[in-house]
């Protein structure tokens, strides 16, 4: 099963630096909505990794919208003062990693993952579907990346980012990968896999931005997000080619990206099971 389906494209298979997000909605594009008001709001820009101003129309839009710069930073940036994370220093875990597992009060019984501060590991638990707290992850991988320590006692996420003074672009700094990468693909490629809320078990693929590969997951049939593809090829075509590898010697290999991306159409209604 070749990971490539297009000629003349060079993509290295080394582990890619993750663009870590505290919340998946931080990866959404700024959405001014269909209304015509002029309201100053802030959104998190995944390409500059900074909170920026935009004009909101006053209705609809998405969750990547904040009343203030401070609120945006609080929700979407991990360390506002120092954007470079040294691997020799343990990166601080978010406070919510230390909250105990909380099923919430509803009765949905959805499998989720939480960081157990006693065992220092991410573990499975049953979430009811509403309320609870933020120590609640849809995938084990997401939980580990945010809350677990690596094998040497450091955070798993030990990549930093640094603003490049030459062209104001972001270049991730990594101890694992000698070359540098930038992500120029669709923002939904950075969101976690989302099963949705229905009962089906459809085979789908999502792009795992932590390891830079398309991985299978089970889709419930409704809800979820746009990081959801019917085939691995389609997933790779939409997401993997968004990475540009900067070669150490200054060369640049730009991967081809087709303009049109066929994506799975997702129905955003929810089907709730009676007596949930």
């Amino acid at each position: 099963d070749s990971e490539e389906d297009e000629e003349h494209t060079i993509i290295t298979d080394t582990e890619l630096p993750p663009l870590k997000l505290m919340h998946s909605f931080c990866a959404f594009k700024a959405d001014d909505g269909p209304c015509k008001a002029i309201m100053k709001r802030f959104f998190f820009n995944i390409f500059t990794r900074q909170c920026e101003e935009f004009i909101y129309g006053g209705c609809e839009g998405n969750q990547n919208r904040f009343e203030s710069l401070e609120e945006c930073k609080k929700m979407c940036t991990r360390d506002n003062a120092n954007r470079i994370i040294k691997t020799t220093l343990q990166q601080e875990k978010p406070d919510f990693c230390f909250l105990e597992e909380d099923p919430g009060i509803c009765r949905g019984y959805i499998t989720r993952y939480f960081y157990n501060n006693q065992t220092k590991q991410c573990e499975r638990f049953k979430y009811g579907g509403c309320l609870g707290n933020m120590n609640n992850f849809e995938t084990l991988e997401e939980c580990k990346n945010i809350c677990e320590d690596g094998p040497n006692g450091f955070q798993v996420d030990n990549y930093g980012t640094q603003l490049n003074a030459v062209n104001n672009s972001l270049t991730p700094q990594s101890t694992k990968v000698p070359s540098l990468f930038e992500f120029h693909g669709p923002s939904w490629c950075l969101t976690p896999a989302d099963r949705g809320l229905c009962r089906a078990n459809e085979n789908r693929f999502y792009y795992n931005s932590v390891i830079g590969k398309c991985r299978p997951f089970k889709y419930s049939g409704c809800g979820g997000n746009e990081n959801n593809f019917t085939s691995k090829q389609e997933c790779l075509r939409a997401c993997k080619k968004g990475f540009i590898q900067r070669i150490s010697k200054g060369g640049l290999i730009k991967t081809k990206r087709k303009r049109k991306k066929q994506r799975v159409k997702i129905a955003y209604e929810e089907i709730f099971v009676k007596n949930m």
């Epitope: 969750q63 099923p103 009060i105 509803c106 309320l131 609870g132 809320l197």
Partner: antibody, heavy 121, light 107 residues
């Protein structure tokens, strides 16, 4: 039919502790499918959620940030009731306090009759 | 916290009128929304839960719709006993929050 009966003083002095109790009939405070909470209502602030407790193999609580440092909600399984304690009250805490039951799908389906608590010296 | 914004804050209507109250959440709350009716000196009374489900014993003239961020409570034919304050309430995320209320008055 679930019923919630509130009791407690209507007048509390500033800096003291507000204590209210909610007695449950028709359900159990230890139910694995319900939750129990307190809400208050004042003219200036509308309906304000204060916190809840619930039992799912062990006890959990969830408190509003605005009162987190001062609030305790405790179950009393022997009397099938739960209580609210709010420490260091000020006149700002003057409100009608309600206890409520949360159903297994999250909404509040039964409410106590309400207790007007005035904080004044 | 999720902000719940109700509109209008008050309205005047006559018996028999069709009344619509809207509630907007500051972010998606899926279908975790309830509507309550409150009369002076009384506790709120549950009308609608999970956005569109009618609570047992509530007259069928009350109905709810919506999901995500925009929700509506409709009273198809206003009755004298319906004059009250109506609140929406989200229970998707903690802390649970309420709208500021809509007062339905007699015209």
């Amino acid at each position: 039919q679930v019923q919630l009966q509130q009791s407690g003083p209507g007048l509390v002095k500033p800096s003291q502790t507000l204590s209210l109790t909610c007695a449950i009939s028709g359900d159990s405070v230890s139910s694995n499918s319900a939750a129990w909470g307190w809400i208050r209502q004042s003219p200036g602030r509308g309906l304000e959620w204060l916190g809840m407790i619930y039992h799912r193999s062990k006890w959990y609580n969830d408190y509003a940030v605005s009162v987190k440092s001062r609030i305790t909600i405790n179950p009393d399984t022997s009397k099938n009731q739960f209580s609210l304690q709010l420490n260091s009250v000020t006149p700002e805490d003057t409100a009608v306090y309600y206890c409520a039951r949360y159903s297994s799908i999250g909404h509040m389906d039964y409410w106590g009759q309400g207790t007007l608590v005035t904080v004044s010296s | 916290d999720i902000q719940m914004t109700q509109s209008p804050s008050s309205l005047s209507a006559s018996v028999g009128d069709r009344v619509t109250i809207t509630c907007r959440a500051s972010q998606s709350i899926r279908s975790y929304l309830a509507w309550y009716q409150q009369k002076p000196g009384k506790a709120p009374k549950l009308l609608i839960y999970k956005a569109s489900n009618l609570q047992s014993g509530v007259p069928s003239r009350f109905s709810g719709s919506g999901s995500g961020t925009d929700f509506t409570l409709t009273i198809s034919s206003l009755q004298p006993e319906d004059f009250a304050v109506y609140y929406c309430h989200q229970y998707s995320d903690s802390p649970v929050t309420f709208g500021q209320g809509t007062k339905v008055e007699i015209k």
